[in-house]
Interface confidence: low
């Protein structure tokens, strides 16, 4: 179930979830108005101070890079 992740645990979780895509700590793109937390907060606020689930972590993954054209 959802749990809080802080410090190194948070970085490890993001690396696992996002893989080669990388991740960022500032606000995720496409942040919906229905989201529980404040739009301006970062992942530390979201997932360390409060409970956090996999879907929330995924919102902080960098976008997939388009394939290079031949």
């Amino acid at each position: 179930g959802p749990e809080t992740l802080c410090g190194a645990e948070l970085v490890d979780a993001l690396q696992f979830v996002c893989g080669d895509r990388g991740f960022y700590f500032n606000k995720p793109t496409g942040y919906g108005s229905s989201s529980r937390r404040a739009p301006q907060t970062g992942i530390v606020d979201e997932c360390c101070f409060r409970s956090c689930d996999l879907r929330r972590l995924e919102m902080y993954c960098a976008p997939l890079k388009p394939a290079k054209s031949a």
Epitope: R36, A38, S51
Partner: antibody, heavy 120, light 112 residues
Framework: QVQLVQSGAEVKKPGASVKVSCKAS????????INWVRQATGQGLEWMGW????????GYAQKFQGRVTMTRNTSISTAYMELSSLRSEDTAVYYC?????????????WGQGTTVTVSS | QSVLTQPPSVSAAPGQKVTISCSGS????????VSWYQQLPGTAPKLLIY???KRPSGIPDRFSGSKSGTSATLGITGLQTGDEADYYC????????????FGGGTKLTVLG
């Protein structure tokens, strides 16, 4: 029905500790955070902190950090709030209230309150 | 002193409409979800409005909520004597000392 039932009134001396219990029933205890809120006589509501019964993780208001401890026993669906180094200004009604950690619905179910009196 | 500011008291006659304001800042109301609670004398608070403007089941549509910028408003129409109570706004504050914050409360008196 869904309810939170709190322990009875307490009278404590300054410097002592108090532990208030909050027993949940009628819902899945581990699916909702438990918040603790207090209210001194004639005053407003003051948030003390939250606990996730699923993980046991907590977040405390800055004012209470170092003095408050929130725990749970999932086998009996009960949350606890312990406040130490009590002083007269801690005399208040203490409430537990639930809210789902997966979305924001506000604190939709409250306990009946536990009166804590700190007096020498 | 509360982070969220409410008028200490408001009053109106039965059947009338009343609004209660709640003023905050960008670190709380503007970028978070606002809830409103009703506390009748001697009882625990009761959730009236969540997510700025939604009513839990069982709350009559006489109660409404709105939010604009750093302020939120609770509206009550068709006032009844049973509405006489204290009303509190609440949200998250995401400043350095993050956590839930309540307004100071507003005492609603139904005249008559």
């Amino acid at each position: 029905q869904v309810q939170l039932v709190q322990s009875g009134a307490e009278v404590k001396k300054p410097g002592a500790s108090v532990k208030v219990s909050c027993k949940a029933s009628g819902y899945t205890f581990t699916s909702y955070d438990i918040n603790w809120v207090r209210q001194a006589t004639g005053q407003g509501l003051e948030w003390m902190g939250w606990m996730n019964p699923n993980s046991g993780n907590t977040g405390y208001a800055q004012k209470f950090q170092g003095r408050v401890t929130m725990t749970r026993n999932t086998s009996i669906s009960t949350a606890y709030m312990e406040l130490s180094s009590l002083r007269s200004e801690d005399t208040a009604v203490y409430y537990c209230a639930r809210d789902p950690y997966y979305y924001y619905y506000g604190m939709d179910v409250w306990g009946q309150g536990t009166t804590v009196t700190v007096s020498s | 002193q509360s982070v969220l500011t409410q008028p200490p008291s408001v009053s109106a006659a039965p059947g009338q409409k009343v609004t209660i304001s709640c003023s905050g800042s960008s670190s709380n109301i503007e970028n978070n979800h606002v809830s409103w609670y009703q506390q009748l004398p001697g009882t625990a608070p009761k959730l009236l409005i969540y997510d700025n403007n939604k009513r839990p089941s069982g709350i009559p549509d006489r109660f409404s909520g709105s939010k604009s910028g750093t302020s939120a408003t609770l509206g009550i129409t068709g006032l009844q004597t049973g509405d006489e109570a204290d009303y509190y706004c609440e949200t998250w504050d995401t400043s350095l000392s993050a956590g839930r914050v309540f307004g100071g409360g507003t005492k609603l008196t139904v005249l008559g």
